[in-house]
Amino acid sequence: AVDLTLLANLRLTDPQRFFLTCVSGEAGAGRGSDAWGPPLLLEKDDRIVRTPPGPPLRLARNGSHQVTLRGFSKPSDLVGVFSCVGGAGARRTRVIYVHNSPGAHLLPDKVTHTVNKGDTAVLSARVHKEKQTDVIWKSNGSYFYTLDWHEAQDGRFLLQLPNVQPPSSGIYSATYLEASPLGSAFFRLIVRGCGAGRWGPGCTKECPGCLHGGVCHDHDGECVCPPGFTGTRCEQACREGRFGQSCQEQCPGISGCRGLTFCLPDPYGCSCGSGWRGSQCQEACAPGHFGADCRLQCQCQNGGTCDRFSGCVCPSGWHGVHCEKSDRIPQILNMASELEFNLETMPRINCAAAGNPFPVRGSIELRKPDGTVLLSTKAIVEPEKTTAEFEVPRLVLADSGFWECRVSTSGGQDSRRFKVNVKVPPVPLAAPRLLTKQSRQLVVSPLVSFSGDGPISTVRLHYRPQDSTMDWSTIVVDPSENVTLMNLRPKTGYSVRVQLSRPGEGGEGAWGPPTLMTTDCPEPLLQPWLEGWHVEGTDRLRVSWSLPLVPGPLVGDGFLLRLWDGTRGQERRENVSSPQARTALLTGLTPGTHYQLDVQLYHCTLLGPASPPAHVLLPPSGPPAPRHLHAQALSDSEIQLTWKHPEALPGPISKYVVEVQVAGGAGDPLWIDVDRPEETSTIIRGLNASTRYLFRMRASIQGLGDWSNTVEESTLGNGLQAEGPVQESRAAEEGLDQ
């Protein structure tokens, strides 16, 4: 059962001092989603018992395993049902506390009733303030039964529930017809899923015989021990003022557990702490009584004395619950109450015994839950005890349950039951997850959902190249951290699998499903350098670069040119997708801008080192295009061009540039400067006869301007081949300006 206790402080004279505390002894309890388990929850449950709304209650977390509810302002705040929820996953457990008003018309003789399936439950409500009206019994808030007020027996109204079944469990209340719900007597009925002394799915298994008022859990057969007792069968008393499954918790305050109600997981319910009784748990046990609610009687023999917290304290030479066993009778010593092994392991179990006559190897035996008896393979005999060692056959799940070590001598016999939990090693249900990859390493998240049992003690990551027959490489990692697989081959697929382990021998689970993770390309290592660049216009830049010569193939897919405009804080990236390229034309740049330029080699998504940067200043944008460009053939080698000056000039023109190209020709165009900017006409000489030419021109101020329209004209006749065009210009005369 989950180690979860809900404590109610019942000092009811002052509701503001009332508090509820939920304490978990579970590992990692209450730490929230960053640990293995969800947090503890403690709340008032208003679904069944609705009380007038008050100020909100204050919840305070004290460390990782304790939560306290305070802020009750008036007695009516206390009345009703409170619950604490703790434990993780399938072990998530709700502990319930039902609070009755001490001033109610009806009071429960006993709040919690735990009964077996098929039993008759009797709820008894004692008349505290009489009303001459019907008494209504409700179950989980709905009408259940009516009693006439005359039907009280000895000042009590009884509700008999014959042959109860688990669905009958819940909150019951008895209320006078015209009374407020705060005047009700509230009860909690817990119906175990099995008949007395049985547990398991078909109630086929036998309970271990819980002592000191412990209750056998109908699902797992474990004893839920009263506060103040521990052990598989609750056979051991805690020191006064301590509680929890291992007696690890201590009652707060100087008066120990006085005034505290303890609620434990079903089917136990609630009771006073060991040594206390009464509706407010403030009365010490009467002589001869002990335990929770003082329900147990000592009946000590052979001079034993009764301690109200632990029961009989035996004089030397005697032991047993009632000091009824002589120390001559053999006795099992220091047997662990619970052992845990992994499935399919073959553990060794030791069982030590003492007595007179002295136990020998053959007098100690081990009995499994299915009744199989194991004999010890060897025994270690010491002056004060004999320890028998048992080699257990390969464990199966059915071996989970209560085992028994038994010693028999002529002096008598003793046996000790202990719980064996056979755990299933964890097996990942999913493959690990790739977080990031590089050329030589993969970062992997190894923690995945798993079948089987936790906790996870180690995580092993197995990996090897895909389709390889070589041995797997293995790395052991912390369960909560990501793993970096290093020294891998670039651009290689790796098969990666997770293996989980739980504590103990044989705790390694099977490997989980594989997943394919691929490393990145190798990083390009060569650093280019910029050979040069020249401006081909106010918005065009031609760049060239080189790479160092190295043996072997070039590791790279292309080049990335970066232009950084520091003034505007903008970066321009140009991708050159051939690794053989060594030049590129950058267009669409911003005229008059100062750029920082660099180039780097890339491979897949990885960039190599950048070249040393160059600083380039593009000229500002030039003037508008000249207007009305016209061409007129003058001879077989001359063509005259005329134009008009551009409009809206930003400054004086420094020159014109004429572009001459043979129509349909494949060669580069020729640029000819007209250095006298005032002219509006020029003659291009040295042309070939009977050849069609294309002309366009632009002006320059600080930078070159826009091109004019293109015009076509053919030279005349069939003259000799000219050496190449030249130019003569003058201011166009009015007569020539057509």
Epitope: R50, Q132, T133, I136, K138, G141, S142, Y143, F144, Y145, T146, L147, D148, H150, E151, T175, L177, E178, S180, P181
Partner: antibody, heavy 124, light 108 residues
Amino acid sequence: EVQLLESGGGLVQPGGSLRLSCAASGFTFSRYRMDWVRQAPGKGLEWVSGIYPSGGHTYYADSVKGRFTISRDNSKNTLYLQMNSLRAEDTATYYCARLYLWGSYPTQVAFDIWGQGTMVTVSS
Amino acid sequence: DIQMTQSPGTLSLSPGERATLSCRASQSVSSTYLAWYQQKPGQAPRLLIYGASSRATGIPDRFTGSGSGTDFTLTISRLEPEDFAVYYCQHYGSSPLTFGGGTKVEIK
């Protein structure tokens, strides 16, 4: 389906006896208070008697006290009304009814299920 | 004993009209134990309202109960043909249980 079915009515002479039965079905009879209500021809409703679930406590209208006895058999889901020393003024249709209590606070009470009635005629 | 008096004895109205029925207790009673029933000729009574104002399952919302102390009212906002019947109020307290004398709602 929740229902109540009365039987046992008929013609009887003054001073005679009759036993009415009411068979319940569709609900847990043993948990509810049950009552008899009658209606003389052309008149209003008159409460006659009531019995608590345990059968241990019973109540009667003054007009029938000492002559009528209400009882129940929870194992048979049946309510009875034993009528002795019958008079002409007992002539009526007799209905059995379930007293229901709504679980909220404050608890509300009413007869939510009625039988179809059985006619009792007392005449010489 | 508590007496329950209903008025008027007969109420003659046309379909679509509003009906207001009154029930007066001889002493103050708890509204949570006041119920109204409808009875048609040859049929058993049928629960309409419990707790003075809560409609029973399946009862149309044209039926409304109200009141406290000694004076209680059943209102039928718009009479439908099937609403013409006798209506009884009833109180549950210490024995005996008491019914009012009834109000007959008939077609005008």
